[in-house]
């Protein structure tokens, strides 16, 4: 038998520095977790102790903190090179700055293979990107070879900016011929490494003949065997075992997100490359693991530019940006409108001639808006200002919901109106009218939504049975502020871009902003 140790990360999302337990900014260093310096310590410790070790990343290194905003992926290449990753799969967020924003900082600089079997380049891009990412790579490990085949969410065109010259094929259809090719090269130990979410990971394990292990990402899935060491609740055991259609037991793993854990999977293969056994658990990278001094010094060197950036002007406002709780928790506020407009603007994807855009709606809990911005400071808006408005380091995500769920969400928005509670919703692409004289749960008297399948956008009544795409904070997608119905009833959830980054990009693009209160949210009494 031959033993392989797979160390894996996914959805690190720009958490190069250590973070607090909830993956936001580190405040009390003695209680902080993750970060590349701490990750390196643990990886090196395992490399020294065990003979056959692979360090893999399942995508979405890009996007999530000011590190990505400033360095645009150069930081990913630099520190992944320093940690000596063996391979990475492309995630959807790797395309956030377009194909050029992937090629220049990452593909050209990585000292390790970057993989995806189901992304096919066409037109002029085909030769430009040729060889910069691969469908698979064969890596020697000890005296054996291991094949690693990559995959990426086929929803990427709706979630990021890959452009029109990349085709995202069905994962299973694209993977099978590449795995078959590896088999003809006498590679009998094959890992599928990719970024399509836990459900697709399990399908790949079930359907793709010849895949021995699946290492996934995208869904931020936490798997654990035994008592979990932190706040994350396991979605299943680690590894999660799938019985393939041809009767094999295929381990599937993922390691939550944000570099908080290092996935640790030990696989035992027989001489024919069959998996005999698999066991392990994610390792919580808490403060009991010291940060590597040389990586930490490098992080501190790179940090300097970030501090300078946060005080530079992004754009100007010529109006007061009312982000006060007195406004945003009680009525339509122009800060809420600004943020929602930025959220929609960030999700403009013209992927179908029938639709002016794939999504038109935004909801945002008023309690998530933490500060106003005064225009009487020469109108200047900085990253620092925005960090006061959106201090939680969240993301603006894409979900699919039925109209009935949205109706419940808007009822919840005002079910205890008047107590300055955070669940009051700010909106974009939605016109809502509340009648507070009615009993809680029956206060939404009008709910119109902006059409997407139209050349001239207009507002139509919400249909209860229709499925709608909505942009909202990850906090709401996860049921925060009591929006349990969103968490329980959402049909799809794809994590998006860092909240501050979305708003800062919009302000930089617009240069001068003047958001108004314009009747998106109204109150009435009497009949309708």
């Amino acid at each position: 038998a031959w033993e392989l140790t797979i160390l894996h990360t996914n959805d690190v999302h720009s958490r190069l520095e250590q973070t607090s337990e909830d993956s936001s900014k580190c405040v009390n260093a003695s209680r902080c977790m993750g970060g590349v310096a701490r990750l390196f310590t643990k990886v090196q410790q395992i490399r020294r102790a065990e003979p056959n070790v692979l360090l893999l990343d399942a995508g979405d290194q890009y996007q999530g903190t000011i590190w990505f905003t400033v360095y645009k992926g150069a930081e990913v290449a630099h520190f992944m090179n320093a940690l000596r990753y063996d391979a990475m799969a492309l995630g959807n967020h790797e395309f956030d700055n377009g194909v050029e924003g992937l090629i220049e900082p990452l593909l050209k600089e990585a000292k390790f293979p970057i993989l995806s079997a189901n992304i096919k380049a066409k037109g002029p891009l085909a030769s430009q990107i040729s060889g910069l990412y691969l469908p698979y790579k064969v890596l020697p490990v000890g005296d054996e070879v291991v094949g690693i085949v990559g995959y990426t969410s086929k929803e990427t065109p709706f979630l990021s900016n890959p452009g029109t010259n990349l085709v995202f094929e069905d994962e299973i259809t694209a993977l099978q011929p590449e795995v078959d090719k590896l088999k003809t090269l006498n590679v009998n130990k094959i890992i599928a490494l990719g970024h399509s979410g836990f459900e697709m990971d399990k399908l790949i394990a079930q359907k793709v003949r010849g895949v021995d292990v699946v290492v996934g990402g995208h869904s931020n899935t936490f798997l654990y065997t035994g008592n979990p060491p932190s706040k994350e609740v396991p979605a299943g055991k680690y590894p999660f075992i799938v019985t393939s259609d041809d009767g094999r037991k295929v381990p599937v793993v993922q390691a939550y997100a944000f570099g908080k854990y290092l996935g640790y999977l030990k696989i035992e293969f027989d001489e024919r490359g069959n998996v005999i056994s698999s066991h392990g658990n994610p390792i919580l990278l808490n403060s009991s693991i010291p940060e590597d001094p040389s990586i930490k010094a490098d992080i501190n060197k790179w940090r300097i530019k970030l501090d300078n950036y946060s005080t530079q002007e992004l754009g100007k406002t010529i109006v007061y940006l009312d982000g006060s709780s007195q406004s945003c928790r009680f009525r339509e506020c122009n800060m809420g409108n600004l943020i929602c407009d930025a959220m929609i603007n960030n999700n403009l994807r013209h992927t179908d001639e029938m639709f002016w855009n794939h999504v038109s709606m935004c909801i945002l809990n008023g309690g998530g808006i933490r500060s106003p911005i005064d225009e009487r400071n020469n109108g200047t808006i900085t990253w620092e200002n925005l960090a006061a408005v959106l201090p939680f380091g969240g993301t603006f995500d894409l979900v699919q919901l039925k109209g009935s769920t949205l109706k419940k969400a808007f009822e919840h928005s005002v079910h205890r109106y008047g107590q300055s509670t955070g669940e009051f919703l700010q909106v974009g692409g939605i016109h809502v009218v509340y009648d507070l004289s009615r009993k809680p749960g029956d206060r939404v008297v009008k709910l119109d939504v902006l059409c997407t399948k139209c050349r001239v956008p207009s507002y139509d009544p919400l249909k209860m049975d229709e499925v709608y795409k909505v942009i909202l904070p990850n906090f709401l997608a996860n049921g925060g502020d009591g929006f349990q119905m969103i968490k329980d009833e959402l049909l799809r959830h794809d994590s998006g871009d860092q909240d501050i980054n979305v708003v800062s990009t919009y302000i930089s693009k617009m240069k001068v902003i003047y958001p108004a209160v314009e009747g998106r949210i109204k109150f009435s009494t009497g009949s309708h």
């Epitope: 000596r84 220049e104 050209k108 990585a110 000292k111 390790f112 293979p113 430009q128 040729s130």
Partner: antibody, heavy 117, light 106 residues
Framework: QVQLVQSGAEVKKPGASVKVSCKAS????????MHWVRQAPGQGLEWIGE????????NYNEKFKSRATLTVDKSTSTAYMELSSLRSEDTAVYYC??????????WGQGTLVTVSS | DIQMTQSPSSLSASVGDRVTITCKAS??????LSWFQQKPGKSPKTLIY???IWVDGVPSRFSGSGSGQDYTFTISSLQPEDIATYYC????????FGQGTKVEIK
Amino acid sequence: QVQLVQSGAEVKKPGASVKVSCKASGYTFTSYWMHWVRQAPGQGLEWIGEINPSIGRTNYNEKFKSRATLTVDKSTSTAYMELSSLRSEDTAVYYCARRVYGTMDYWGQGTLVTVSS
Amino acid sequence: DIQMTQSPSSLSASVGDRVTITCKASQDINSYLSWFQQKPGKSPKTLIYRANIWVDGVPSRFSGSGSGQDYTFTISSLQPEDIATYYCLQYDELYTFGQGTKVEIK
């Protein structure tokens, strides 16, 4: 297929400059960095520097920083290495090589530069 | 600057012999090490990168291993066409070649 075709041999006087070219074909020139390496007669390989053709960014061996200049012409997919203030010890074969995964993969055929009075 | 010490500077072996060349870096180079073969009057040819990964089409008799500061290049069964000079290169911090090892057949 990937090819790097270099310019012909040069004979130069001490104190002069030489400009060696490397024309790339079979791939998109701007998608990969280009290295320059030299080899004096009977000696080992010595790295001079590298250039990112899409943005013109360069990294140099400290030894050559003041005398070597790396440039590109994107329209013709050609990389250039100019070495100034030549001395007899600069007599060498100069190679261009494409960078992949941080190292070299494809190499040019080499250009012999002879510095002699 | 990282220094690379390659040894031996030359060796003579018989066809079929196992040949080993070593490279020692002046500091940990994180396995960012390549091996090249250069035949007389020819350009170098890349054989191995990342200490142990073969370039496509390179015969399996060539292999690399090592980590940290110490690396080894092995020809498991020397062939007449393997007569050449072999170089290591570190690419962890910029680039430094080893001095080369000339391999001859007895």
